[in-house]
């Protein structure tokens, strides 16, 4: 029996009945075995077919078989109800081999020409399966010449059988206090040949509770306990399961903070699996009772491990742990069922005793010594000599624990000295002057330090003077001996002050004229203001209206008198302001250099002479009365003049203070 071509030879060719295209003889039996490469099949079709027709093709026939299976028994020329002729049909081997058998019996009623057939090997598409048959691959099938291979979706791995996709379902760790886990693909059928391990791992102190939910369907067996697929639950204490079948297992209270769930499946079956909802519990902490005037947040039915609460106090109350203030308070429940911090108190805010007000006093309005939330106090300044700056002095104890003014300020009010007060009445008839009485010039300052000079008190810790009077001490401020509150130059009864710093105008050049002859002395302590020590006012913007030509100013000091000696008693003189051009002209003739009198100076005195300031008065104030405010202000600073004080046709020259208000204000605010 011819075998026909065999792989690896090219697998294609022609088969024909003996004697074709002539008639075939009786009693013939021919067999061909065709073999294709692995992964290939054989295709066969007939181009001619003419065999004796007989019932069930018992006489003459062509039989096609593949392995043990008969694919077709063929006879006749055309098919009938019980016999089959190939016609235009194509026949395929089931595997890679095809057997063809031709047989004729002992007789033919008429001549038959037999058959002619062609065959060829072709690739099997293993990925195509007949309806109702199991698919070749679990997930993806890929055909190629001579074979096929399977692959899996993400999250799966190809089993060693090369067809099944096992789930990659191990190593998942659940650390939240509650959650859900399920079999792979749930509620669709779970994968075959898989071994899944899930871990629930909570902090020590928690206990995991497992609830099976929705549906449960794991392959089972009527007699044996879960031999195919099963679910097991393991804790450090015990094992639960195996579970299979269609009944939802009962709740499992594991009494453990760690749980391992194992799910194993075999190669067969079509079941939907399972779903677990897990929760956890722990030993509850005592229910937190809010302190008076406070509340707990969040409010829960119970508080277990890791739960926390915060305490918030009502407005006007603060968190205190004993005497210690807290901005916030949060307690956390511990595994032993205790809170990690003790409950604080919500105590009424206490602003404490108010600070003392220099040169002022404080009065408790709400009640004696009451300093708690919403309490009111009233600051006031010592009458006559001090006035309160900016606010009304009313302070309230606010929720932040600070005494706060109606303007929202937390700093103390300031008692500012009242300036420009004098016991002197204006008018009345130093050089050519008269003796001052107590309280006439309470701003008068005596400056000793090498020479005798004067100054005027500003506020309660500054002295305004002439630059030339303190120039030598500018780097040694402590050398200045500053005295105030006395009329007698040599009296032992005076208020002593010391200098902290000397500020000389940057435009002043010593020994080169007297332009910018102005200086400020900062005192190292504030002086107490009284009827004998009161600051002079600085000129207002409108002050020029009180300093026109012929307006009377008053100069005071202990300078040289007509006798040629320093005055023992404070002297003063009332002198008119001199027209600026007139004064400029008076000092343009020798021995005075041109430009001696500048726009930063003003002149005062009588054309006839006799009334003037003199050496020793330097730095003192030339003051004017502001008739609107009824306060005295400094218009000029004793600066220079003719060699002979009170000389006719010559005038006293004073630094024009109004030109220096920005400079004064800047220094005082900066230092």
């Amino acid at each position: 029996t011819p075998l026909g071509p065999k792989w690896p030879e090219p697998v294609f060719g022609r088969l024909a009945s003996p004697g074709f295209p002539g008639e075939y003889a009786n009693d013939q039996e021919r067999r061909w075995t065709l073999t294709a490469p692995p992964g290939y099949r054989l295709r066969l079709y007939f181009t001619h077919f003419d065999l004796e027709l007989s019932h069930l093709c018992e006489y003459d026939f062509v039989k096609l078989s593949s392995g043990a299976k008969v694919l077709a028994t063929l006879c006749g020329q055309e098919s009938t109800d019980t016999e089959r002729a190939p016609g235009k049909d194509t026949f395929y081997s089931l595997g890679s081999s095809l057997d063809i058998t031709f047989r004729s019996d002992y007789s033919n009623e008429k001549p038959f020409t037999g058959f002619e057939a062609f065959y060829a090997a072709e690739d099997i598409d293993e990925c195509q399966v007949a309806p109702g048959e199991a698919p070749t691959c679990d997930h993806h099938c890929h055909n190629h010449l001579g074979g096929f291979y399977c692959s899996c979706r993400a999250g799966y791995v190809l089993h060693r059988n090369k067809r099944t996709c096992s789930a990659l379902c191990s190593g998942q760790v659940f650390t939240q206090r509650s959650g859900e886990l399920s079999s792979p693909e749930y509620p669709r059928p779970y994968p075959k040949l898989s071994s899944c391990t899930y871990s629930i791992s909570l902090e020590e102190g928690f206990s995991v509770i497992l609830d099976f939910v929705e549906s449960f369907d794991v392959e089972t067996h009527p007699e044996t306990l879960c031999p195919y697929d099963f679910l097991k639950i393991q804790t450090d204490r015990e094992e639960h399961g195996p579970f299979c079948g269609k009944t939802l297992p009962h709740r499992i209270e594991t009494k453990s903070n760690t749980v391992t769930i194992t799910f194993v499946t075999d190669e067969s079956g079509d079941h939907t699996g399972w779903k677990i909802h897990y929760t956890s519990t722990a030993q509850p902490c005592p229910y937190p009772m809010a302190p008076p005037n406070g509340h707990v947040s969040p409010v829960q039915a119970k508080y277990i491990l890791k739960d926390s609460f915060s305490i918030f106090c009502e407005t006007g109350y603060e968190l205190l742990q004993g005497h210690l203030p807290l901005k916030s308070f949060t307690a956390v429940c511990q595994k032993d069922g205790s809170w990690d911090r003790p409950m604080p108190a919500c105590s009424i805010v206490d602003c404490g005793p108010p600070d003392d007000l220099p040169s002022g006093r404080v009065e408790y309005i709400t009640g004696p010594g009451v300093t708690t939330y919403k309490a009111v106090i009233q600051y006031s300044c010592e009458e006559t000599f001090y006035t309160m700056k900016v606010n009304d002095g009313k302070y309230v104890c606010e929720a932040d624990g600070f005494w706060t003014s109606s303007k929202g300020e937390k700093s103390l009010p300031v008692c500012e000295p009242v300036c420009g007060l004098s016991a002197r009445t204006t008018g009345g008839r130093i050089y050519g002057g008269q003796k001052a009485k107590p309280g006439d010039f309470p701003w008068q300052v005596l400056i000793l330090g090498g020479t005798t000079a004067a100054g005027a008190l500003l506020y309660d810790n500054w002295v305004l003077t002439a630059a030339h009077a303190v120039y030598e001490q500018k780097h040694d401020a402590s050398a200045l001996d500053i005295r105030m509150g006395t009329l007698k130059r040599l009296s032992p009864h005076y208020t002593q002050a010391w200098s902290e710093a000397v500020f000389i105008h940057e435009g002043y050049t010593h020994d080169a004229g007297f332009d910018n002859d102005i200086a400020l002395i900062k005192l190292n302590n504030k002086v107490v203001i009284n009827s004998n020590i009161t600051p002079i006012c600085l000129p207002r913007k409108e002050a020029e209206s009180f300093m026109r030509t012929d307006d009377i100013g008053t100069a005071s000091g202990w300078g040289l008198t007509q006798r040629g000696f320093l005055a023992r008693n404070l002297m003063y003189v009332d002198i008119p302001i001199v027209d600026h051009q007139k004064c400029t002209a008076a000092y343009e003739k020798p021995p005075y250099p041109r430009g001696s009198v500048t726009a930063n100076m003003l002149c005062a005195g009588l054309e006839s002479g006799g009334k003037d300031s003199c050496r020793g008065d330097s730095g003192g104030a030339l003051v004017f009365l502001d008739s609107e405010t009824e306060r005295w202000f400094v218009g000029g600073i004793v600066s220079w003049g003719s060699m002979n004080c009170g000389e006719a046709g010559q005038y006293g020259v004073y630094t024009k203070v109004i030109n220096y208000i920005p400079w004064i204000e800047n220094i005082i605010s900066d230092f």
Partner: antibody
Framework: DVQLQESGPGLVKPSQSLSLTCTVT?????????WNWIRQFPGNKLEWMGY???????SYNPSLKSRISITRNTSTNQFFLQLNSVTTEDTATYFC???????WGQGTTLTVSS | DIVMTQSQKFMSTSVGDRVSVTCKAS??????VAWFQQKPGQSPKPLIY???YRYSGVPDRFTGSGSGTDFTLTISNVQSEDLAEYFC?????????FGAGTKLELN
């Protein structure tokens, strides 16, 4: 990690003022708590001097109230102790601490001597 | 001021022993008491706050108890590194005050 570090002169003359600085790292002094000064005299006796709270409020030991001032600089995260008119009795090791007392500085030793 | 009295200036103990350091407040201070441990040349180290709460990192052999006026620090299994001076401290009432200290020594 929260750390407190004291710094100061080491030696001060009687009647002068003492100024100490506590520099806090790892926690803002305005976030919470009371920031305290505590001193330990030779012989180990401890004395609470006062605190400045997260809000800037102060509380002082009445035995020192006329001489003590505690202030802070929130931008540099420091708080300060000023003690005026010191005497030899103020010789001690000065600690700054966050209360609830959970963090202390290493301390700085101050000697008052002429 | 509230006086915190630590009646024993010194206490002798052996490694492995259980020892209790006591402190008495002159007035009720609630639970607002802390305990500190101090070794020579070091700053006080916090052990206990609010009478019985251990600071984190403090070994559980240290236990605080008491409220009101009587307070105790117990060291259940004394180790050689526990030999130090122990101070109680009240922060209930202004001004805050400390005990004079109790020195723990080896027998």
């Amino acid at each position: 990690d929260v750390q407190l570090q004291e710094s100061g002169p080491g030696l001060v003359k009687p009647s002068q003022s003492l100024s100490l600085t506590c520099t806090v790292t790892g926690y803002s002094i305005t976030s919470d708590y009371a920031w305290n000064w505590i001193r330990q005299f030779p012989g180990n006796k401890l004395e609470w001097m006062g605190y400045i709270s997260y809000s800037g409020r102060t509380s002082y030991n009445p035995s020192l109230k006329s001489r003590i001032s505690i202030t802070r600089n929130t931008s540099t995260n420091q708080f300060f102790l000023q003690l005026n008119s010191v005497t030899t009795e103020d010789t001690a090791t000065y600690f700054c601490a966050r209360y609830w007392g959970d963090y202390w500085g290493q301390g700085t030793t101050l000697t008052v001597s002429s | 001021d509230i006086v915190m009295t630590q009646s024993q200036k010194f206490m002798s103990t052996s490694v492995g022993d259980r020892v209790s350091v006591t402190c008495k407040a002159s007035q009720n201070v609630g639970s607002n008491v802390a305990w500190f441990q101090q070794k020579p040349g070091q700053s006080p180290k916090p052990l206990i706050y609010s009478a019985s709460y251990r600071y984190s990192g403090v070994p559980d052999r240290f236990t605080g108890s008491g409220s009101g006026t009587d307070f105790t620090l117990t060291i259940s299994n004394v180790q050689s590194e526990d030999l130090a001076e122990y101070f109680c401290h009240q922060y209930n009432t202004y001004p805050l005050t400390f005990g004079a200290g109790t020195k723990l020594e080896l027998n």
